[in-house]
């Protein structure tokens, strides 16, 4: 598998998409995890709901939220209140059984936000009543991974 | 009505290369995976493999890997069981089966079986 | 590999029998579990999945139960067109295993 680049922008939602065949993963939940090293484990973070004909609706753990369009074959992996610490390397997978396919190997880029450096009153803070997610635009700039590049930095 | 149809019954030699068939019909047969079962003599049934005929993804059973190849060719809804060089204990029967994902437990079981390929291999 | 072992390997019972035969896994499989009968000379016909649903035109006499390790197939009253031997097969991981199978004979 190729790895996908999605960069967000700290403090702000990321949106990772990972596209599959639909009629190939029928009926198999879905799930988001996290890579731990290089050739370590994929620790899930997030799978879809537990009825796969209910899958559309959006599950969150913490900060991150899964849905699936089964039928247009796209998971969407949404990334709330993006921090630095969100950086690295994830697996978007199928499930069947105790087994995963990987559908899409995602790198996770950080940005820092430009509004940092500038004094609090400067900044806009959303009110009680508006939700996150209507206050940030979700950015999303995905790339592939160049031939050479690595996801990890090398260990000695 | 879905179907799975195999090909006739085989009678090789050691050392012989064969290729036998299963041609699905009644269903989308690039929709559902198929597997290989090998059925020796009286005995059990033994997964061998499996192939999504709409991209050619295959997994083996590690007994079987590097001993078989499973193939699809989605424009004649066939899948294809092969062996370049049969041994005796290759003498069975091989049965094909649709593998379908039941959404309730997103696994997958064998819902059609083809009528099986008996390959009986003799010097 | 997941071993699975089905006890007993035979068993002879009369029409209007109840019985029951158990499955083994060798480690956890939730239930992911699939029941099948096979006649001689025929290919196998999946009765159960996911260890307690019955497929479509199997007859009610037939259930499946159990999770994790532990599985069971009952007949609740034998027909004549039951006798024949039954295989479990586990579908939680790969490679996908059978139990060894038990033969079902009229007493």
């Known amino acids: 598998h190729n790895t996908t680049v999605f960069q967000g922008v700290a403090g702000q939602s990321l949106q990772v998409s990972c596209p599959y065949d639909s009629m190939k993963h029928w009926g198999r939940r879905k799930a988001w995890c996290r890579q731990l090293g290089e050739k370590g484990p994929c620790q899930r973070v997030v799978s879809t709901h537990n009825l796969w004909l209910l899958s559309f609706l959006r599950r969150w753990n913490g900060s991150t939220a899964i849905t699936d369009d089964t039928l247009g074959g796209t998971l969407t992996i949404t990334l709330r209140n993006l921090q630095p610490h969100d950086a690295g390397l994830y697996q978007c997978q199928s499930l069947h059984g105790s087994e995963a396919d990987t559908l899409r190997k995602v790198l996770v880029e950080v940005l820092a936000d430009p509004l940092d450096h500038r004094d609090a009153g400067d900044l806009w803070f959303p009110g009680e009543s508006e939700s996150f997610e209507d206050a940030h635009v979700e950015h999303s700039i995905s790339r592939s991974l160049l031939e050479g590049e690595i996801p990890f930095p090398p260990t000695s | 009505e879905v179907q799975l149809v195999q090909s006739g019954a085989e009678v090789k030699k050691p050392g012989e290369s064969l290729k036998i068939s299963c041609k699905g019909s009644?269903?989308?047969?690039?929709?559902?995976?198929i597997a290989w079962v090998r059925q020796m003599p009286g005995k059990g049934l033994e997964w061998m493999g499996i192939i999504y005929p709409g991209d050619s993804d295959t997994r083996y059973s590690p007994s079987f890997q590097g001993q078989v190849t499973i193939s699809a060719d989605k424009s004649i809804s066939t899948a294809y069981l092969q062996w370049s060089s049969l041994k005796a204990s290759d003498t069975a029967m091989y049965f094909c089966?649709?593998?379908?994902?039941?959404?309730?437990?997103?696994?997958?079981?064998?819902?059609?079986w083809g009528q099986g390929t008996l390959v009986t291999v003799s010097s | 590999d997941i071993q699975m072992t089905q006890s007993p390997s035979s068993v002879s019972a009369s029409v209007g029998d109840r019985v029951t035969i158990t499955c083994r896994a060798s480690?956890?499989?939730?239930?992911?579990l699939a029941w099948y009968q096979q006649k001689p000379g025929k290919a196998p016909k999946l009765l159960i999945y996911?260890?307690?649903s019955l497929q479509n035109g199997v007859p009610s006499r037939f259930s499946g139960s159990g999770s994790g390790t532990d599985f069971t197939l009952t007949i609740s009253s034998l027909q004549p067109e039951d006798f024949a031997t039954y295989f479990c097969q586990q579908a939680d991981s790969f490679p996908r295993t059978f139990g060894q199978g038990t033969k079902l004979e009229i007493k």
């Open positions: 009644g269903y989308s047969f690039t929709s559902y995976w």
């Open positions: 996911a260890a307690a």
């Open positions: 089966a649709r593998q379908r994902t039941f959404y309730y437990d997103s696994s997958d079981y064998f819902d059609y």
């Open positions: 480690q956890g499989i939730s239930s992911w």
